[in-house]
């Protein structure tokens, strides 16, 4: 990487290196030969998360309830607010600017991973021996009924959407 004129946590201004402001503070005035960099803390609704020379702090993110958002972690002078989604919703992006309802797994599919505030439902096809006959955001694929354990026989084969149908054993020879 190219050479730099200053130390780490400094910046070059007027041919002189000045200290950057620490996280949580903004720049008021550059240093001079005789004075240090002047910095001021960010207000309660603002933050700066790096060593910086910003003259304005960034506003904390607003978790808009109209978009299904709620506060997961309140911001500080050094960190932004973290939003998450209300129950039954998940973020549309990593920055979580809006929420959409969790999807349901259609019949023939089961829930592999239940949705969270930041991730959608993950569905998987029901393998042979399993089925799902409902549209659900929670239900896993269920195993076919075992007719043998009930002393019954399979009368109708199961599918990925239907259970087997059991019936009595045929006594005729």
């Amino acid at each position: 990487e190219p050479p730099t004129a200053c130390r780490e946590k400094q910046y070059l201004i007027n041919s002189q290196c000045c200290s950057l402001c620490q996280p949580g503070q903004k720049l008021v005035s550059d240093c001079t030969e005789f004075t240090e960099t002047e910095c001021l803390p960010c207000s309660e609704s603002e933050f700066l998360d790096t060593w910086n020379r910003e003259t304005r702090c960034h506003q904390h993110k607003y978790c808009d309830p109209n978009l299904g958002l709620q506060v997961q972690q309140k911001g500080t002078s050094e960190t932004d607010t973290i939003c998450t989604c209300e129950e039954g919703l998940h973020c549309t992006s990593e920055s979580c600017e809006s929420c959409v309802p969790h999807r349901s797994c259609l019949p023939g599919f089961g829930v592999k991973q239940i949705a969270t505030g930041v991730s959608d439902t993950i569905c998987e096809p029901c393998p042979v021996g399993f089925f799902s006959n409902v549209s659900s955001a929670f239900e896993k694929c269920r195993p076919w009924t075992s007719c043998e354990t009930k002393d019954l026989v399979v009368q109708q084969a199961g599918t990925n959407k239907t259970d087997v149908v059991c019936g009595p054993q045929d006594r005729q020879r």
């Epitope: 730099t4 004129a5 200053c6 130390r7 041919s15 290196c17 000045c18 001079t32 960099t37």
Partner: antibody, heavy 126, light 107 residues
């Protein structure tokens, strides 16, 4: 007391590499930048660059960019300077030098060297 | 890069003499300047920093002055152990640069 002890003299062929070590004692190694300065026979002092032993961050003089690598091992309080593709005009005494403490400086880089290693003579000759 | 020009390159003086060495920067460096003394076969030794602050343990016959581009190192009364080469160094921005040196020799 503060001491910087460097590795011994080296004789290298042109095109080879050399790695010089600088073992620090008597102070908190990670609290001060370490610089490397060289001096060709009968010549003046030439700054090569620095390493921040705390972060591992480095800054090299343009002249040595791409040829020099400064590293450190905090577990043994030792800084290293490796110079590649050696030429005959790299023949010099190489010094490590301790800077002022981190956070000492608010304006300027104020890099003044209060402690120096004893120097390592690197001779490049075919 | 900031060029540091020292003068004279050498000076012959006697014990007890007052010796003055000057250093000029190619651009303003405020007071970010150091002076070093180096004896043959030895590492440099810090004498003065921030143009005029005497390093701990350095005799008071050494003094520094100046600001901006022009700086001076003065040895008020030269002692036998002061015969050496002296270097100035700017500490305003990287890359750090040194003057070419001034050799103080016995007359």
């Amino acid at each position: 007391q503060v001491q910087l002890v460097q590795s011994g003299a080296e004789v290298k062929k042109p095109g080879a590499s050399v790695k010089v070590s600088c073992k620090a004692s008597g102070y908190t190694f990670t609290g001060y930048y370490m610089h490397w300065v060289r001096q060709a026979p009968g010549q003046g002092l030439e700054w090569m660059g620095w390493i921040n032993p705390d972060s591992g961050g480095t800054n090299y003089a343009q002249k040595f960019q791409g040829r020099v690598t400064m590293t450190r091992d905090t577990s043994i309080s030792t800084a290293y300077m490796e110079l590649n593709r050696l030429r005959s005009d790299d023949t010099a005494v190489y010094y490590c030098a301790r800077d002022q403490p981190l956070g000492y400086c608010t304006n300027g880089v104020c890099s003044y060297f209060d402690y120096w290693g004893q120097g390592t003579l690197v001779t490049v000759s075919s | 890069d900031i060029q540091m020009t020292q003068s004279p390159s050498s000076v012959s003086a006697s014990v007890g003499d007052r010796v003055t060495i000057t250093c000029r920067a190619s651009q303003g460096i405020y007071s970010w300047l150091a002076w070093y003394q180096q004896k043959p076969g030895k590492a440099p030794n810090l004498l003065i920093y921030t143009a005029s602050t005497l390093q701990s343990g350095v005799p008071s016959r050494f003094s520094g002055s100046g600001s901006g581009t022009d700086f001076t190192l003065t040895i008020s009364s030269l002692q036998p152990e002061d015969f050496a080469t002296y270097y100035c160094q700017q500490a305003n921005i990287f890359p750090l640069t040194f003057g070419g040196g001034t050799k103080v020799e016995i007359k």
